[in-house]
């Protein structure tokens, strides 16, 4: 439960974070679990502890193993484990699965690829980026802070991306590389003139006097996240809040349900204790977005209770 997997390549820097968190002023002790040997804090050592962090500068295959960190707080000690594996560098271009960080997906609108674990290191821009071992060149690729931005993403941009940067520790430089897969989602979002799915235009809704009634206004506005979209009810052309009848309230239903990939909104009109005068009102379901406004009108009619004869 309190264990985290970390991996790196021999002769590169690797910095590992203790899985237990605490306040900056808490002392953190590190041990090599197999021998219970304390990890030194002096920076002259190749492997040393620095608070929440354990640093391998640089890492060696023999460093592989489980490391214990103990965060010492005023009332109890919290123990965590870092499972560290250091791999030999591959001679060929393929990055094996065990060296891959989590896959990220992007689309035409959002194509940021973050360099994994970089926040742990003392690095300076620019980052170098590679795709399938080839250095990325061209105006479509922009290394920005700790991420890569790809303009006009296409399906061919899917693949394994490696970031390479230099970690600086007391004037000494160490190389770090990290690789993750990038997949491209075909997320062509669009916006349409609102389509009201319910109620039907000029629908007659049967209600029972004295009972509660619900009317649902449901509309779709296109695909993907919508910049501006709303559904609401009006009574005789007046907003519900301005109409001033506390028995009649509206509340949001499914807030943005992507059924069939469509962005839809629901608004439920709740009428408590239906009265005769409610049958005289005009109920308008309104759906609006940047394209315009669509309105469907509903009227209420009395539903005669069914007589039960023995």
């Amino acid at each position: 439960k309190f264990s985290k997997q970390s991996w790196g390549l021999e002769n590169e820097a690797l910095i590992v974070r203790c899985p237990r968190q605490g306040k900056p002023s808490y002392t953190v002790d590190w041990y090599y679990s197999q021998t219970n040997k304390s990890i030194p804090t002096q920076e002259r050592n190749r492997v040393f502890a620095s608070g929440q962090l354990l640093k391998f500068l640089p890492a060696a295959v023999a460093d592989s193993g489980i490391y214990t960190c103990i965060v010492r707080s005023p009332t109890f000690n919290r123990t965590g484990y870092a499972n560290v594996t250091i791999y030999k560098k591959q001679s060929d271009c393929n990055v094996p699965d065990y060296l891959m960080y989590s896959t990220v997906s992007g689309s035409e609108k959002n194509s940021k690829i973050y360099c994994p674990t970089i926040d742990l290191y003392n690095w300076t821009a620019p980052l170098e980026w590679f795709k399938n071992c080839q250095a990325l060149q061209g105006s479509r690729y922009r290394a920005h802070k700790s991420f890569l931005v790809i303009d006009n993403v296409m399906t061919e941009d899917a693949g394994d991306y490696t970031c390479k940067f230099i970690h600086n520790e007391n004037g000494a430089n160490y190389s770090v590389t990290a690789t993750r897969s990038f997949t491209v989602k075909d997320e062509q979002g669009f916006s349409l003139f609102p389509v009201i799915g319910a109620p039907a235009q000029n629908e007659i809704k049967e209600v029972e006097i004295g009972k509660n009634a619900n009317l649902t206004c449901s509309a779709c506005f296109g695909k993907g996240t919508q910049f501006l979209a709303a559904v609401l009810w009006q009574l005789n052309g007046t907003k519900i809040t301005d109409f001033g009848e506390p028995r009649i309230q509206q509340e949001e239903g499914q807030n943005q349900s992507f059924s069939n990939g469509l962005a839809c909104l629901d608004m439920v009109l709740r009428i408590a204790d239906v009265k005769e005068e409610d049958l005289l009102l005009q109920y308008d379901c309104l759906a609006l977005n940047l394209h315009g406004l669509r309105r469907h009108t509903v009227r209420l009619s009395r539903k005669n209770p069914i007589d039960h004869h023995s």
């Epitope: 309190f2 899985p19 010492r72 707080s73 009332t75």
Partner: antibody, heavy 116, light 113 residues
């Protein structure tokens, strides 16, 4: 700059649940735990619990155990607090606050009103 | 649980005068492991979240004016505003930052005399 942005006000009926979100920006989310604190009208601040954002391990205050669930989504740099079986005395402003020496960074607060 | 008791409940002070708020904890907030007192002070204005003023009983948070100071150790702590300004009108809270559950004092309302 560090920012914690919380979800909007909620009105709930007794017995219902509420889930409040807290989106962090301006720092590395998994480097710091996230606390949840509430303040009922005219009452003192009350710590509800915190979550280790790195491994997702929550710790709850005794007063809330069994009713509160604190989670996080590292990909969205967001922490969540869900409180169930709401009662009128849960009407309060709920805050997220980043762990540190004291709580230097707070969300703007989310008013949860429990009313029948 | 550690109980935090603040006094007074409210305090009326003239502008430019000194304001002193006390806070007592039911258990020591001193951690012998690093000799830190885990006590924090906050200022809260209406409609706003609390703002951290002091942590570690006496360390001022960056950006906090130096008229705010904290002192004390173990179970007895004090927040002092050396020369009260109009913008200091607020409720002040102390907090046990030592052990779970983190607990807060009942607050002290500072007003202008």
């Amino acid at each position: 700059q560090v920012q914690l942005v919380q979800s909007g006000a909620e009105v709930k009926k007794p017995g219902a649940s509420v889930k409040v979100s807290c989106k962090a920006s301006g720092y590395t989310f998994i480097n710091y735990g996230m606390n949840w604190v509430r303040q009922a009208p005219g009452q003192r601040l009350e710590w509800m619990g915190w979550i280790n954002t790195y491994i997702g391990e929550p710790t709850y205050g005794d007063n809330f155990k069994g009713r509160v669930t604190i989670t996080r989504d590292t990909s969205a740099s967001t922490a969540y607090m869900e409180l169930s079986s709401l009662r009128s005395e849960d009407t309060a402003v709920y805050y997220c606050a980043r762990e540190g020496e004291g709580f230097a960074y707070w969300g703007q607060g989310t008013l949860v009103t429990v009313s029948s | 649980d550690i109980v935090m008791t603040q006094s007074p409940d409210s305090l009326a002070v003239s502008l430019g005068e000194r304001a002193t708020i006390n806070c007592k904890s039911s258990q020591s907030l001193l951690y012998s492991g690093n000799q830190n007192n885990y006590l924090a002070w906050y200022q809260q204005k209406p409609g706003q979240p609390p703002k951290l003023l002091i942590y570690g009983a006496s360390t001022r948070e960056s950006g906090v004016p130096d008229r705010f100071s904290g002192s004390g150790s173990g179970t007895d702590f004090t927040l002092t505003i050396s020369s009260l300004q109009a913008e200091d009108l607020a409720v002040y809270y102390c907090q046990n930052d030592h052990s779970y559950p983190y607990t807060f004092g009942g607050g002290t309302k500072v007003e202008i005399k």
